[in-house]
Amino acid sequence: IFPLAFFIYVPMNEQIVIGRLDEDIILPSSFERGSEVVIHWKYQDSYKVHSYYKGSDHLESQDPRYANRTSLFYNEIQNGNASLFFRRVSLLDEGIYTCYVGTAIQVITNKVVLKVGVFLTPVMKYEKRNTNSFLICSVLSVYPRPIITWKMDNTPISENNMEETGSLDSFSINSPLNITGSNSSYECTIENSLLKQTWTGRWTMKDGLHKMQSEHVSLSCQPVNDYFSPNQDFKVTWSRMKSGTFSVLAYYLSSSQNTIINESRFSWNKELINQSDFSMNLMDLNLSDSGEYLCNISSDEYTLLTIHTVHVEPSQETASHN
């Protein structure tokens, strides 16, 4: 029979825990229950994170950065649970934590590697810069550096500009794409490999609509089934571009099923909304209604942008009066 080997120079039991910035996590550690339990959690084998012995916490020499942020599962210690509850993790908390548990008859050392990720919901924006049109995928705070990919009509695009700003603890990233004169559909994907979280932005341009003054226009906005899940909270915003900036006409929040309308001539069909169809009507068109109309359906996992260009032309009567 071969002995079961434990090399002194081989790392101990090691687990990886992935946390999200500002959220609480648990660093796991278990032992065979016994009397006279001593528990020490240390960071990078030197900073004291949490100490427990003689039936209570002893935090006199705890490193100040962990003050009021750590606790044990006190009712479960006698059952062999030495896990650490860790509040509001930051990127500075990343690293190796060692849990030393001693009892009167056994000593155990467990290592936990903590990795922290950040993924504040990205956005896809449509911007006009002079005569150029841009789609911008951006994420305000992300860590580690994400993978950003663009597709045009479902075909990957190799050119991929990234404007990156690094702060103390995360990256802020903009990825602009010049889409001037294009009526293709575009898709941008931002992936955080650590948190295994992916966000997708999709932009679709609809054919231009020509309408006469005083008529009404119906603009479609139906989410693509690939991304859309009606069970997930989302927001729908209709806006109109005037002089390079968008003004909000109306929005709908799925969580409260509230619709807020800022333009009296705008109407939404409640029945269609219940069927996840966010098409809208704009009544009594006038010449100043010409422009680009943007439907934005957004959740934590996607942004779907649909753009319509509306041309309002003078009616025959108006033309003859002039």
Epitope: F6, M12, S51, A104, I105, Q106, I108, T109
Partner: antibody, heavy 116, light 107 residues
């Protein structure tokens, strides 16, 4: 009665390796951590490390990294320590000792002499 | 690593004396201190853990005390069989460390 019976004295040449055994009886082998302690001639005690027979992660002293390898054979309730790349500095008495963070029971010690 | 200092390598005493052996830790070890007795040619023997808890079978003339960084092993009335080397050990954290030892001798 708890007993920890260690293997006999060893005389080895520099650069060689040696494996010391510690056979236990009188208690449940898997419940206790088995520690190893070095006592150089006329000197104090130095803790080398421990091993948990039931696979839990075991603590060790970084000073002995690459020098000592601890193993157990649960079927015979025996713990082993192998020391490699031996030099005269490794000449000492080596004890096995069972317990948690203090050591309740000790073996009688194994004297290791490293000499050419 | 935590350093355990036993400042007296030797202590000259007489039978029946009250003897105090001291040990100082380089940092607060929260009473996680054990004391061992080692007689010539023998293995160490556990006397006390947690600074003052006597191990099974240890005579009550041996008592431990202390807190923070300063610890003491007291033998209330020295007997002939107590002549030995005494080591302190911190069991607060790994790596466990021992003092250099204090040897009791007769004057």
């Amino acid at each position: 009665e708890v007993q920890l019976q260690q293997s006999g004295p060893e005389l080895v040449k520099p650069g060689a390796s040696v494996k010391i055994s510690c056979k236990t009886s009188g208690y449940t082998f898997t419940e206790y951590t088995m520690h190893w302690v070095k006592q150089s001639h006329g000197k104090s005690l130095e803790w080398i490390g421990g091993i948990n027979p039931n696979n839990y992660g075991a603590p060790y002293n970084q000073k002995f990294k690459g020098k000592a390898t601890l193993t157990v054979d649960k079927s015979s309730n025996t713990a082993y320590m192998e020391l490699r790349s031996l030099t005269s500095e490794d000449s000492a008495i080596y004890y096995c000792a069972s317990g948690g963070y203090y050591f309740d029971y000790w073996g009688q010690g194994t004297t290791l002499t490293v000499s050419s | 690593d935590i350093v355990m200092t036993q400042s007296h390598k030797f202590m000259s005493t007489s039978f029946g004396d009250r003897v105090s052996i001291t040990c100082k830790a380089s940092q607060d070890v929260g009473t996680a201190v054990a004391w061992y007795q080692q007689k010539l040619g023998q293995s160490p023997k556990l006397l006390i853990s947690w600074a003052f808890t006597r191990h099974t079978g240890v005579p009550d003339r041996f008592t431990g005390s202390g807190s923070g960084t300063d610890y003491t092993l007291t033998i209330s009335s020295l007997q002939a069989e107590d002549l030995a080397l005494y080591y302190c050990q911190q069991h607060y954290d790994t790596p466990f460390t021992f003092g250099s030892g204090t040897k009791l001798e007769i004057k």
